[in-house]
Structures are given as structure tokens and as C-alpha cells.
Interface confidence: low
């Protein structure tokens, strides 16, 4: 079952999935000036059997000006319904990605894809958070969020991460006025998770997935 909302946003933090549960959909979004080819799928779907999971369909974008070259389009409004976004760049690379049963890895980038990847997560998905450059974690706790089913509704658990500037007083979440989310709906937190395209993230994941260490490179 799809999660009803986006993962919570944490001020001055970004989130990332290490792997995507089967059933996850990724919208085939194209950057400005490009659109999805007419015969192309509107999304990629993580599917699998007992031994292997992979992304069905491929995203292809074509130049809005050109008629016959292969390449993709921003989904129509109906395709954007209940859209999920990581608001992280496609250039982001996940190093040493683990293989988890029933999960797909981060899909490789496609030509002329949009800078923002929009996922439709499913119940049971976990995403991990880290503070952005220039901010540090104010206190420890599970810096992750899991989409869970509660009372027949889906809800993301709340990551215990507060990111504060080295020279700033600590900011308690929610004291800023939240900004509108990319799709125009109010969001659950106050942060801007969109990052620049030179942001890269590497992860080292213990085999048990009990500990998750983010190492970030900025170039």
C-alpha cells in the first residue's frame, strides 16, 4: 500500500532511501525543455520475485522541440496525485549500496531527467536523514523515518534529528513558519530539502542495517 504523505521534513536536513521496497514507484520526470516520450511509461516500478528485485520500465525523455528523438515528460496532474518526493538530485550517487531482499537499488539516472526525483513510497519504507553542510545534529536518536500503517492510515514515524548551525542557537523544530511544499500542499516541516547538483552522498551500511553512517562530500 502506498504511503499517504511525504516523509517528514527536518529543517536543514535531507533524506535518502538506501533501497526501495517492492511496489515503490518513481515518476519519470524530465528537466525543463524535455518531456516523456509518448509511448514511455509515466513511472518506474520496483518489482521482483523471491530472489531478485529490479525497476520495471525505463524513463525516456525527448526534447520538447524535437518530435522524433528519444528522451520524457513531467507527469500530468492526474499522474502527480499523491506524489512522493525525495527532493534530492539525480546526480546523487549511493556508494556501496546494499542489496536487501525485496528492495530495489537507487535507479541509475536517465538522460535529461529532472533534478528532483519523485517517489511513491510504500508501507515499510525507511528513509534516512542527515544534516546539510554547515549544520550539525543537535541530539542523537533514530535519524530515520519509517512509513507505517496505524489505525488503517499510513504515517511516517518522526526522525529524532535537529540540525543546528555551528554558530546559531539551537532551533526547535516548528518554530519557523513552514513553507509550501513543491506540489502546493502544506508540508509537515519547515525545511527546504532541495540540494544543489554538486551534492553527493555516500553511505556505508552495516550488514544488519542497525547503524547507518552518512559521509558527505562537497565539491
Amino acid at each position: 500500500e502506498l504511503c499517504d504523505d511525504d516523509p517528514p521534513k527536518i529543517t536543514h536536513a535531507t533524506f535518502k532511501a538506501v533501497a526501495y521496497k517492492e511496489g515503490t514507484m518513481l515518476n519519470c520526470e524530465c528537466k525543463r525543455g524535455f518531456r516523456r516520450i509518448k509511448s514511455g511509461s509515466p513511472y518506474m516500478l520496483c518489482t521482483g520475485n523471491s530472489s531478485h528485485s529490479s525497476w520495471d520500465n525505463q524513463c525516456q525523455c525527448t526534447s520538447s522541440a524535437a518530435r522524433n528523438t528519444t528522451k520524457q515528460v513531467t507527469p500530468q496532474p492526474e499522474e502527480q496525485k499523491e506524489r512522493k518526493t525525495t527532493e534530492m538530485q539525480s546526480q546523487m550517487q549511493l556508494a556501496d549500496q546494499v542489496s536487501l531482499p525485496g528492495h530495489c537499488r537507487e535507479p541509475p539516472p536517465w538522460e535529461n531527467e529532472a533534478t528532483e526525483r519523485i517517489y511513491h513510497f510504500v508501507v515499510g519504507q525507511t528513509v534516512y536523514y542527515q544534516c546539510v553542510q554547515g549544520y550539525r545534529a543537535l541530539h542523537r536518536g533514530p535519524a530515520e523515518s519509517v512509513c507505517k500503517m496505524t489505525h488503517g492510515k499510513t504515517r511516517w514515524t518522526q526522525p529524532q534529528l535537529i540540525c543546528t548551525g555551528e554558530t546559531e542557537p539551537s532551533q526547535f523544530p516548528g518554530e519557523e513558519e513552514p513553507q509550501a511544499s513543491p506540489d502546493g500542499l502544506p508540508e509537515s516541516e519547515t525545511s527546504r530539502l532541495v540540494t544543489t547538483t554538486d551534492f553527493r552522498i555516500q553511505t556505508e551500511v552495516a550488514a544488519t542495517m542497525e547503524t547507518f553512517i552518512f559521509t558527505t562530500e562537497y565539491q
Epitope: Q158, P159, F172, P173, E177, S188
Partner: antibody, heavy 117, light 107 residues
Amino acid sequence: EVQLVESGGGLVQPGGSLRLSCAASGFTVSSNYMSWVRQTPGKGLELVSFIYSGGITSYADSVRGRFTISRDNSKNTLYLQMNSLRAEDTAVYYCARDDYSNYFDYWGQGTLVTVSS
Amino acid sequence: DIQMTQSPSSVSASVGDRVTITCRASQGISNWLAWYQQKPGKAPKLLIFAASSLQSGVPSRFSGSGSGTDFTLTISSLQPEDFATYYCQQAKSFPITFGQGTRLEIK
């Protein structure tokens, strides 16, 4: 300054209805997780219902199907519609803002609901 | 549901005393715990979140510790305004649950 002010409590007979309101200032209700928490001498503090920014709602088992949480974004107000009230619903009802981590950082002053014949 | 049990249910102390209140969760909740102070006729007030993080504006004589199932709220030097009822609350999973409260009285 963040402020929450509840109203709408009172005496009602079993089976009756009440609508509680919580007027918020200093922040935007629609952009936050909002909850109703009630307090009774017997059961203590109990989370009754919550609604968060995406509009998802949830209810305690004891009130599901009878209570409805909602909000009016234009009035920056949270509501709790309580139907089929029972004696055990007698409590002080607080609206509270969730700090996004299931902690309640701001509370209203509370409004007393008494269900009695 | 996760049950939260506080002890003692009431405690008498004097101004200047160091007071400790404990809270035990029926299952592990990592550090997903908050402490609230409530005075008669008033709403609860958040003191500590994430087990040990002090809420903005709360005096530093309040501190929290613990992880997993056992947690402690400590008031290092009681002030007259600290006499109240204190509640713990787990924030790990739904339904969110509170302890039954510990009443701190003047000796």
C-alpha cells in the same frame, strides 16, 4: 507568540454532541501536526486524535467512529466534533501542537467536557 | 500499546533538594521520551524531549537521562515553582501514551 485557545466545552447528556474549537495564533495550523489530548482523573492524559499537515487523521480506539478532527485553514482553527458522547468521555480536552516528533510543545488552556444525565 | 509507569506516584521534598523521578516503558523506546510539568488548572508544559534535550526556556536545573526502557527526570535544586505533577510520555509508536504522573509536594 504561539497561542492556542480552546472553546466549546460544556455539559451534555449521554448520546449528545459537542464541537470543540481551538483557535491558533503565531503559527499556521495547516502546516503543523495538531492533536487533541484529554485528561481525566481516572485515565490521566490520553491522545484522542491528531491531524497532520497532509490531512491524515487518526483516532484513539475509544473514540474512533464517534469523534472527527478537522481544521479550517482560513480561520487557522482546529476542531473536534464529538458525537454519541459517553460518560467516560468526561474530561478536560486540550488541543496541542506536535513538534513533528510526537512531542507536544504548545498546549491550549483546556476546555471541560462533562457528559452526564 | 506501550505502557509507561512512573515512580514514585508522589514525592515530598523541600526547596533546594535534588529530586529524581523515574519512568519505565513496557518495551524499548530508544530515547523517544518527553517529560511534562503540570500545575493545577493549567495545561502540561514540555520540559524535556528526546529523553535528555531541554526544551527552550526551561531552566537548566531540569535534566533528563535514560534510553531504552528506563528514564529519569532530575531537578537539581528544587525551587518553589517546581512543585507540580510531572508526566512522562513515549513518542516512539502509536498510540502515544503517558505515564500516570508523579506529584511533587512540599515537605
